[in-house]
Interface confidence: low
């Protein structure tokens, strides 16, 4: 004769408030004859959850038809779960007896706990932009999860970060928990196109972690480099001077030309190009008239980037006697 086994496959069952919980229980033998009852807890104070023969259990239904002759499935469903339903549930086989039934064997029990998914992580970066080589902090928050055990990881462009601090609150028992983590990230000059990712893994997510992202483009300022050059060729009595503003981010930029200290209001040609790393280049051309009266011309290209202090580069224009003669000759 096969020995009766009471099989409760789930050690832990996580359910959410308002949903229906299914508690599984199967037996391996029809003998001995007698009912299977469900209890919460153990000992004399245990609570009867379901008895097919007697009592009123409006929230409990059976998965199988218990009246069928060879039924070996005694699983139940409990509807409209509330926090009051948490605890360990046991299916218990009784041997039919007289004057009363005798407890014969209990299943190992299934602990029912309230499980709640964490909210989608929200990642927030620094309030102000910072230049490369400096460290910035990003925070990641997720709320409303249970149980308390949770895993949080940080990534930058797919590479896991190690410099972060994480707190889960509250420290004691609670219906739901929150996590907050702060990661320190060193900015690189090419980080305009970089991302930081906060990844949260929790038992309720069934192996599919939640992710929150932030773009480093919101946190970085790459200051420009300036170069002012005089073009060797000239057009008539004009010399072309170029100001190249390289590798800056964000795009916000103001460029002004000064001639011998006087700001020039006239239009200048310019082009803006985007580099592969997300930074920008700006090139501005300035045409200077050459005449015999102009022995010394000092040109200044001044750039104000993203509200920062202006930076400038000067060029003392080299106008050879030959050039001046040529320009004089060209003047009608």
């Amino acid at each position: 004769e096969e020995e009766l086994q009471m099989i409760q496959p789930e050690k832990l069952l996580l359910v959410t408030v308002g949903k229906t919980a299914t508690l599984h229980c199967t037996v391996t033998s029809l003998l001995p004859v007698g009912p299977v009852l469900w209890f919460r807890g153990v000992g004399p104070g245990r609570e009867l959850i379901y008895n097919q023969k007697e009592g009123h259990f409006p929230r409990v239904t059976t998965v199988s038809d218990l009246t069928k002759r060879n039924n070996m499935d005694f699983s139940i469903r409990i509807s409209s779960i509330t926090p009051a339903d948490v605890g360990t549930y046991y299916c218990v086989k009784f041997r039919k007896g007289s004057p009363e039934n005798v407890e014969f064997k209990s299943g190992p029990g299934t602990e029912m706990a309230l499980g709640a998914k964490p909210s989608a992580p929200v990642v927030l970066g620094p309030a102000a932009r910072t230049t490369p080589e400096h460290t910035v902090s990003f925070t990641c928050e997720s709320h409303g999860f249970s149980p308390r055990d949770i895993t949080l990881k940080w990534f930058k462009n797919g590479n896991e970060l190690s410099d972060f601090q994480t707190n889960v609150d509250p420290t004691g028992q609670s219906v739901a928990y929150s996590i907050r983590s702060t990661a320190r990230v060193v900015l690189d000059p090419w980080d305009v196109r970089s991302q930081v990712i906060c990844e949260v893994a929790h038992v309720t997510l069934q192996g599919d972690p939640l992710r929150g992202t932030a773009n480093l483009s919101e946190a970085i300022r790459v200051p420009p480099t300036l170069e002012v050059t005089q073009q060797p060729m000239r057009v008539g009595n004009q010399v072309n001077v170029t100001c190249q503003v390289r590798k800056f981010y964000p795009q916000s930029l103001q460029l002004t030309w000064s001639e011998n200290g006087n700001v020039c209001q006239r239009e200048t040609a310019s082009t803006l190009t985007e580099n592969k790393d997300g930074t920008y280049n700006w090139t501005s051309w300035f045409l200077v008239n050459i005449s015999d009266q102009r022995d010394d011309v000092v040109l200044t290209c001044q750039v104000k980037h993203d509200g920062q202090l202006a930076v400038s580069k000067r060029l003392a224009l080299e106008v050879t006697v030959h050039q001046k003669d040529q320009s004089s000759d060209a003047t009608p």
Epitope: K117, S119, V122, T139, E141, G144, R180
Partner: nanobody, 118 residues
Framework: QVQLQESGGGLVQPGGSLRLACAAS????????MSWVRQAPGKGLEWVSD????????YYADSVKGRFTISRDNAKNTVYLQMNSLKPEDTAVYYC???????????GGQGSQVTVSS
């Protein structure tokens, strides 16, 4: 640590008004939708109203529509519930909480008792 503190409850006659406030701390308040729920004596939690993170959109249960107004001040990390034309059936403990993307509610405050009685 996430903290929610409700205030402004009290005893009021039918037809009267109350304004509840919920001060939030320990999380980035402006990034989260917020909600008010209530629990009447001997009953389960009942949803009352939601407000989006930016404050632009609000939602109300049919039982309070036209009488209650939810609002928020992200600068003060506070959400409010203005309750007008109160009825005895509005008697309950009122709780505020944050909402995640799926609409799941996370509370944590002690609640504010509102009693409507003549």
């Amino acid at each position: 640590q996430v903290q929610l503190q409700e205030s402004g409850g009290g005893l009021v006659q039918p037809g009267g008004s109350l304004r509840l406030a919920c001060a939030a701390s320990g999380f980035t308040f402006s990034s989260y939708d917020m909600s008010w729920v209530r629990q009447a004596p001997g009953k389960g939690l009942e949803w009352v109203s939601d407000i989006k993170s930016g404050g632009g959109r609000t939602y109300y249960a049919d039982s309070v529509k036209g009488r209650f107004t939810i609002s928020r001040d992200n600068a003060k990390n506070t959400v409010y519930l203005q309750m007008n034309s109160l009825k005895p059936e509005d008697t309950a403990v009122y709780y505020c909480g944050s909402l995640d993307n799926s609409g799941a509610y996370t509370g944590g405050g002690q609640g504010s008792q509102v009693t409507v009685s003549s």
